[in-house]
């Protein structure tokens, strides 16, 4: 088993609002859960955008998600990871 | 994670109903959503409204204008403020612990009956 | 708001039986669905989250399955301690909101 590297990024998307990224890279096996959260609850599924679970060429895999937050509110929202019974939290950088 | 509510379990029509959940073994301020939800009488469930970890509060919208949740970060508590009661808000009032997609943790429940 | 209905209200099964209790939303809920155990006395425990996965502590014996807008909970060996009332929710959209319950007796 190989454990993510999580990251965490944001990027301007409309007046008041911006768009936060969450990246998962090199990790095996390929299942894995990767979910924004507001107040530590799941945003819905319609909310929220998800890449495919790729190779990345080292015999690991990579995906990503993303959802688009009101400008002010980053500190309600964290970036969710479980992977092989281990998980993680991440924050939206400031 | 143990959750225990507490409260009046009589209230007159048109007044305040304010209940307490007492949380141990998990910081309110450490993560999650604090959820109140009621069951009325027939066993129907209705969720109130959280106050997250960041003290950030989300309702529901059919509660809105009477509902306020507040907590005591020093005491590991959060409370309940419902305003202008009826008799259909007699139910059994709960807090639960949302982490992530579901309420994995609830309280026993505290039974509030709306009378004059 | 999301209407989440339980069938059936209400059932009675012998011990050792397999307990099916359905679920169905009026829209697609992409799998945010949980499954509640309510016992006699009023305690509620979570059982099942995310459609399929089991809360730490459950017995086994507890599944659940579905997509879309139907979901199920599926008791494999009913015991007398699984007599209780069982609530479905959906995670969603909010407001988050509850089935009417099944409750399960014992023949």
């Known amino acids: 088993t190989v454990p993510p590297m999580v990251n965490v990024t944001r990027s301007e998307a409309s007046e008041g609002n911006i768009t936060v990224t969450c990246r998962a890279s090199g990790f095996y096996p390929w299942n894995i859960t990767l979910s924004w959260r507001q107040d530590g609850v799941s945003l819905s599924h319609d909310t929220q955008q998800w890449g495919d679970v790729l190779p990345d060429g080292n015999g690991t895999y990579q995906t990503w998600v993303a959802t688009r937050i009101c400008q002010g509110e980053e500190q309600r929202f964290t970036c969710y990871m479980e992977h092989s019974g281990n998980h993680s939290t991440h924050p939206v950088p400031s | 994670v143990q959750l225990q509510e507490s409260g009046p379990g009589l209230v007159k029509p048109s007044q305040s109903l304010s209940l307490t959940c007492n949380v141990t073994?998990?910081?309110?301020?450490?993560?999650?959503?604090w959820n109140w939800i009621r069951q009325f009488p027939g066993n129907k469930l209705e969720w109130i409204g959280y106050?997250?970890?960041?003290?950030?509060?989300t309702y529901n919208p059919s509660l809105k204008s009477r509902v306020s949740i507040t907590r005591d970060t020093s005491k590991n508590q959060f409370f309940l403020q419902l305003n202008s009661v009826t008799p259909e808000d007699t139910a059994t009032y709960y807090c639960?612990?949302?982490?992530?997609?579901?309420?994995?943790?609830w309280g026993l429940g505290t039974s509030v009956t709306v009378s004059s | 708001d999301i209407q989440m209905t339980q069938t059936p209200s209400s059932l009675s099964a012998s011990l050792g039986d397999r307990v099916t209790i359905s679920c169905r939303a009026n829209?697609?809920?992409?799998?945010?669905l949980n499954w509640y155990q309510q016992k006699p006395d009023g305690a509620v425990k979570l059982l099942i989250y995310?459609?399929?996965r089991i809360h730490s502590g459950v017995p086994s014996r507890f599944s659940g399955s579905g997509s879309g807008t139907d979901y199920s909970l599926t008791i494999a060996n009913l015991e007398q301690e699984d007599v209780a009332t069982y609530f479905c929710?959906?995670?969603?959209?909010?407001?988050?909101?509850f089935g009417g319950g099944t409750k399960v007796e014992i023949k």
């Open positions: 639960a612990r949302w982490r992530n997609w579901a309420m994995d943790y």
């Open positions: 073994g998990y910081s309110i301020t450490g993560d999650y959503a």
């Open positions: 106050i997250g970890y960041t003290g950030s509060t």
């Open positions: 829209q697609d809920i992409s799998h945010y």
């Open positions: 995310y459609t399929s």
């Open positions: 929710q959906q995670g969603n959209t909010p407001p988050t909101t």
